[in-house]
């Protein structure tokens, strides 16, 4: 069975084809090759000689037991080598020779028992080494690591490391890898020698499900003393053994680390006193809780020095009381409990993501809701009912505003966005908005992107609501049940590049409303009911137009519409997916491609 | 279409068939077997994925006695610092995991429940596997 040609001459997918040897019928130009799940078993030297241009090679689950000297010799362009799930028993000293450009080596679940004997010391370009799910017992980083000066990611998770000693990290003292991220999760740790991490600098350290008791966790974290880490991730996994007890003493040792960003990811334990618990983390710049349950929500009003707070997939009794002076970014998404938003006091806040919480807002939105006048980014998407009762007074700095898939009320009662002269991006898609007021978008003089799909208009008519949006470049009006539009609806949109009118109820096409759109490049009218043109004589679309989508409409392929059908043929160079432009009537022509039609009509004198 | 039996409990019998061409082997055990009136137990899965499990989600199509419920999307792996350790599993890596579950207080009517589980993962998104579970429910069968 042949390999699948994914990208001609470049990418080949040969997965699970029962190959016993490397295929030699693929082009020399192959750059990406997936040979996974084939019983190759043995790699002799120069095994991939017929792939001189190869960049990515996937050999996952190929039952490889032996890799000879120079097996990959000649692959000087290879950047990624994946060996996941091979029961390697014999790995020659020169197994990886010739890989002068290798950046990523994945040797997950390959029976690797030690880093010491892993022959990769010459791979100077290596950026990522993944040796997770192996049998490694010692965390001693071999001397050859001093050659791996580009290493950024080292994944040692799911191994058998129990202890870390001062001598294990000696090589890092010799050549501090300033950018190294280290994952030690799911190793059964019970001892970290104090001083082992002294004066070590890491970009990221991840320790999840490493400790089988509170005491072990406490002493191991104390053993991290002296570490300087940009991002520290602690926590557990839902499907692994969890700590039976967790209290403030667990994290006391963190006072002896220098941490820029902290994340606690999943804890099967109720956090009740976060002030004491995170006492050593009051001055990290970024603090993050993922999948934890928080009992006392008032604690977030304590004077933490965080600049970024992230609460994701957590459980709360009610919406937390947030009073944090220094906070610039708040991400509060996919949380449960506390369905009603209550005011927060965050005077420095610039970025606020409150999406996907099912929250309801009794009144939105003004400075008093968020306690800030500095807000630039606000995401309230995928929430409940949001009642618009103020037009963003005090929030004039906003540049990005997203309400999609929330239920907006009172949108047509006043100019909701009047204050937002700096707004660049607005998404009110699928918000149950019924446009019944022409001043709905007044004030949005800087707006570039407007997404309002899935809403509706009074009498299914698009009025002149865009008159102030002179900087608009993208407009989505799809799925709005529109049947007609004002001939001057788009007259002020001279910068508009993309207009999506798809999935509406237009029965005819007219070029007149688009005559002022001098920058228009994409016009999508697919999934309407267009049968013919509004007027007998259709003019040309703006000369800037490059893509016109008229697919899945109800074209009437009859003599009375001959001029319209001819006009469509004249637009051939603009049309996309022409094979999906089919006649709907008459019945004998139903399903026929419009462009292949040859209508010759007799003119009655 | 070969049917794979999972388990029987006092009020339910559970089995599954594959609804994809590939039919990559997957081993599923539930201990103790699910009782629809209330249940607490462990789900054990042994599987070798044909693609990375990063950003894994399930599309669930549930049918109750021939009546179709709306499609449900259950996101399992978001893509970073996920709840489940298997979210970091790579293509070709053994996934051997036990997940605890519990539910209570749901009254199910007697009949045949079908649940098509479409597992989607990776970037670009592609189907990982598709299983159709059949649960025959006999309330108070003892």
């Amino acid at each position: 069975e042949p390999c699948v040609e994914v990208v001609p001459n470049i990418t080949y997918q040969c997965m699970e084809l029962n190959f016993y040897k490397i295929p030699d019928n693929l082009p020399f130009s192959t750059k990406n090759l997936d040979l996974s799940f084939n019983p190759l078993r043995h790699l002799g030297s120069y095994s991939f000689f017929s792939f001189p241009e190869l960049q990515v090679l996937d050999l996952s689950r190929c039952e490889i037991q032996t890799i000879e000297d120079g097996a990959y010799q000649s692959l000087s362009h290879l950047s990624t080598l994946i060996l996941t799930g091979n029961p390697i028993q014999s790995l020659a000293l020169g197994a990886f020779s010739g890989l002068s450009s290798l950046q990523k080596l994945v040797a997950v679940e390959t029976n690797l028992a030690s880093l010491e004997n892993f022959p990769i010391g010459h791979l100077k370009t290596l950026k990522e080494l993944n040796v997770a799910h192996n049998l490694i017992q010692s965390f001693k980083l071999p001397e050859y690591f001093s050659n791996l000066t580009n290493l950024e990611h080292l994944d040692l998770s799911s191994n058998k490391i129990q202890s870390i000693y001062c001598t294990d990290l000696r090589v890092l003292h010799q050549m501090p890898l300033l950018n190294l991220s280290l994952d030690l999760s799911l190793n059964p740790m019970n001892f970290i020698q104090p001083g082992a991490f002294k004066e070590i600098r890491l970009h990221k350290l991840t320790l999840r499900n490493n400790f089988d008791s509170l005491n072990v966790m406490k002493t191991c974290i104390q053993g991290l003393a002296g570490l300087e880490v940009h991002r520290l991730v602690l926590g557990e996994f839902r499907n692994e053994g969890n700590l039976e007890k967790f209290d403030k003493s667990a994290l006391e040792g963190l006072c002896n680390l220098t941490i820029e960003e902290f994340r606690l990811a999943y804890l099967d334990y109720y956090l009740d006193d976060i002030i004491d618990l995170f006492n050593c983390l009051t001055n990290v710049s970024s603090f993050s809780l993922v999948s934890v349950t928080i009992e006392r929500v008032k604690d977030f009003s304590y004077n933490f020095g965080w600049q970024h707070l992230e609460l994701v997939n957590c459980k709360f009794g009610q919406f937390p009381t947030l009073k944090l002076k220094s906070l610039k970014r708040l991400t509060f998404t996919s949380n449960k409990g506390g369905n009603a938003f209550s005011e927060v006091d965050l005077p420095s806040l610039e970025f606020l993501d409150l999406s996907r919480n099912g929250l309801s807002f009794k009144g939105c939105c003004s400075q008093s809701d968020f306690g800030t006048t500095s807000l630039k980014y606000l995401d309230l998407s995928f929430n409940g009912v949001i009642t618009m009762s103020s037009n963003f007074l005090g929030l004039e700095q906003l540049e990005h505003l997203d309400f999609q898939h929330s239920n907006l009320k009172q949108m047509s009662e006043f100019s909701v966005f009047l204050s937002l002269r700096n707004l660049i991006y607005l998404d009110i898609s699928h918000t149950h908005t019924r446009v019944a007021f022409n001043g709905i978008f007044n004030g949005l003089s800087s707006l570039e992107v407007l997404k309002m799909a899935g809403n509706s208009f009074q009498e299914n008519f698009l009025p002149d609501i865009f008159t102030e949006l002179r900087n608009l470049t993208f407009l989505d009006l799809s799925q709005c049940q529109l049947e007609q539009l004002s001939p001057t609806a788009f007259n002020s949109l001279s910068s508009l590049q993309v207009l999506n009118m798809s999935h509406n109820n237009f029965f005819s096409l007219d070029t007149f409303p688009y005559k002022c759109l001098n920058s228009l490049q994409v016009l999508d009218y697919s999934l309407n009911h267009i049968m013919t043109s509004k007027k007998q004589e259709l003019q040309h679309f703006p000369s800037s137009l490059a893509f016109l989508n008229l697919t899945q409409n109800d074209f009437a392929c009859t003599c009375e519409h001959q001029s319209f059908l001819q006009w469509i043929k004249d637009q051939r160079q603009l049309l996309v997916e022409v094979e999906r432009m089919e006649c709907a009537t008459p019945s004998d022509k139903q399903g026929m491609p419009v462009l292949s039609l040859n209508i010759t009509c007799q003119m009655n004198k | 279409q070969k049917q794979y039996w999972v388990c029987n409990s006092s009020d339910a019998s559970i089995s599954y068939t594959y609804c994809d061409k590939m039919q990559y082997p997957i081993s599923i055990n539930v201990n103790p077997c699910i009782e629809l009136k209330r249940s607490k137990g462990l789900l054990h899965i042994f599987y070798i994925p044909r693609r990375d499990l990063k950003q894994l989600y399930f599309n669930l199509y549930i049918t109750v006695n021939t009546m179709n419920l709306p499609k449900r999307k259950e996101v399992i792996c978001r893509g970073s610092d996920d709840d489940y350790s298997f979210c970091r599993a790579l293509k070709g890596e053994t996934v051997n995991t036990t997940i605890s579950f519990s539910f209570k207080g749901i009254k199910f009517s007697k009949g045949k429940y079908k649940c098509v589980v479409e597992a989607i993962s990776g970037s670009p998104e592609e189907m990982l596997f598709c299983l159709e579970f059949v649960i025959l429910h006999q309330p108070n069968s003892n």
Partner: nanobody, 112 residues
């Protein structure tokens, strides 16, 4: 056991020509991917010519138009014709059978 013996190397002036030969034993080469790989001191090794069993050939840009690989299955031999040689063509040239190994190599030195 597969054995590959190269010959034809030597010292040649820039602009000159050489023809390398490689005789294989312990294997029938007709179904094998074969070629030449060169290693110059202090430089990254590179494949300079590859020939498949169907006769299709590959050359990197650095030798394209100057080198030509051919095979004689009856003689179990593969050849490399090198014309318009340049100083940077200096190195040890190894005969390769993909997945089987290489010979001991033959030295090619191009002088000015």
């Amino acid at each position: 056991e597969v054995q590959l013996v190269e010959s034809g190397g030597g010292l040649v002036q820039a602009g000159g020509s050489l023809r390398l030969s490689c005789v294989a034993s312990g294997i029938t080469i007709s179904t094998e991917v074969m070629g030449w790989y060169r290693q110059a001191p202090g430089k990254q090794g590179e494949s300079v010519a590859i020939i498949k069993s169907d006769g299709s050939t590959y050359y990197p840009d650095s030798v394209k138009g100057r080198f030509a690989i051919s095979r004689d299955n009856a003689k179990n031999t593969v050849y490399l014709q090198m014309n318009s040689l340049k100083l940077e063509d200096t190195g040890v040239y190894y005969c390769i059978i993909a997945g089987r190994g290489r010979g001991q190599g033959t030295q090619v030195t191009v002088s000015s």
